[in-house]
Amino acid sequence: AVNGTSQFTCFYNSRANISCVWSQDGALQDTSCQVHAWPDRRRWNQTCELLPVSQASWACNLILGAPDSQKLTTVDIVTLRVLCREGVRWRVMAIQDFKPFENLRLMAPISLQVVHVETHRCNISWEISQASHYFERHLEFEARTLSPGHTWEEAPLLTLKQKQEWICLETLTPDTQYEFQVRVKPLQGEFTTWSPWSQPLAFRTKPAALGKDT
């Protein structure tokens, strides 16, 4: 068995992708390894080749079908194995039973756009990508706005505790460049985590009208 210095972590994007990371201290960088997925109640199985992402970790994506196809449900259990080549045969390094809807990480929101911008306000909308219809409205969002002279880490988080794919940013400074990001998380799942942040959307507030009190 793999000792405590090894980790095997996977997430399901709720549709047709399981992304996995395997790390093992002391493993050879050029070792050929793969992840094999066997669902308990499906006719298909899938394999992906683990590729190095750092000195001691490897990652791969199990592509289960077309991006928007619903390949797994809340009752599925997938047995995931890490196999590494040793000479002419494959050695099993780790075995994990994985409940997909307990291990969710959605794709980052897409299609961010400015709906309306004023001197102190900006209305922004976005869309979720490859998210299961099973969630219905059971999603939440976090958003952040990058102000001049600050970092993303300093930006306060705005929480939307419902499926609301828009936000009205207020108390902005006129004629100022901002960037905006949003991420999404389903409400269900023992190990469910936030999606990656969306690509930043850059926008500029309108300048204050000359001669008027702002």
């Epitope: 793999v2 090894s6 095997f8 994990q96 039973d97 307990e102 799942g189 190990f191």
Partner: nanobody, 127 residues
């Protein structure tokens, strides 16, 4: 904290199946990660399987070769070990264990990670 009682062991022929149960009482079962270990005569205690608090991830010893399935029912305060295609080398005392600390289900835990142990149930596989 919980107390653990295993059951379901016995004598079975090679190729047969057994389902072990581990009933927990006296605590909040869903706040514990649960594991199964085994100890054959003259050998060290060996990891078999471990499942997270909600059962979202379960790690198995490579030696189980996909023959064993660990599951839990938090409503019934019970964790199970379904053992299929049993071999003589599976003969051992099987122990249920509970872990009070957080377990992510992404690595193989050590027996020292578990704080609470059952008394064990004997499994004998004859050839």
């Amino acid at each position: 904290q919980v107390q653990l009682v295993e059951s379901g062991g016995g004598l079975v022929q090679a190729g047969g199946s057994l389902r072990l149960s581990c009933a927990a009482s006296g605590g909040t079962f869903s706040s514990y990660a649960m594991g199964w270990f085994r100890q054959a005569p003259g050998k060290e205690r060996e990891f078999v399987a471990a499942t997270t608090r909600g059962g979202g991830r379960t790690m198995y010893a490579v030696s189980t070769e996909g023959r064993f399935t660990c599951s839990r029912d938090n409503a019934e305060n019970t964790v199970y070990l379904q053992m299929n295609s049993l071999k003589p080398e599976d003969t051992a005392i099987y122990y249920c264990a509970a872990m009070t600390s957080y377990y992510s289900g992404t690595y193989y835990p050590d027996s020292s990670d578990f704080d609470i142990w059952g008394q064990g149930t004997q499994v004998t596989v004859s050839s």
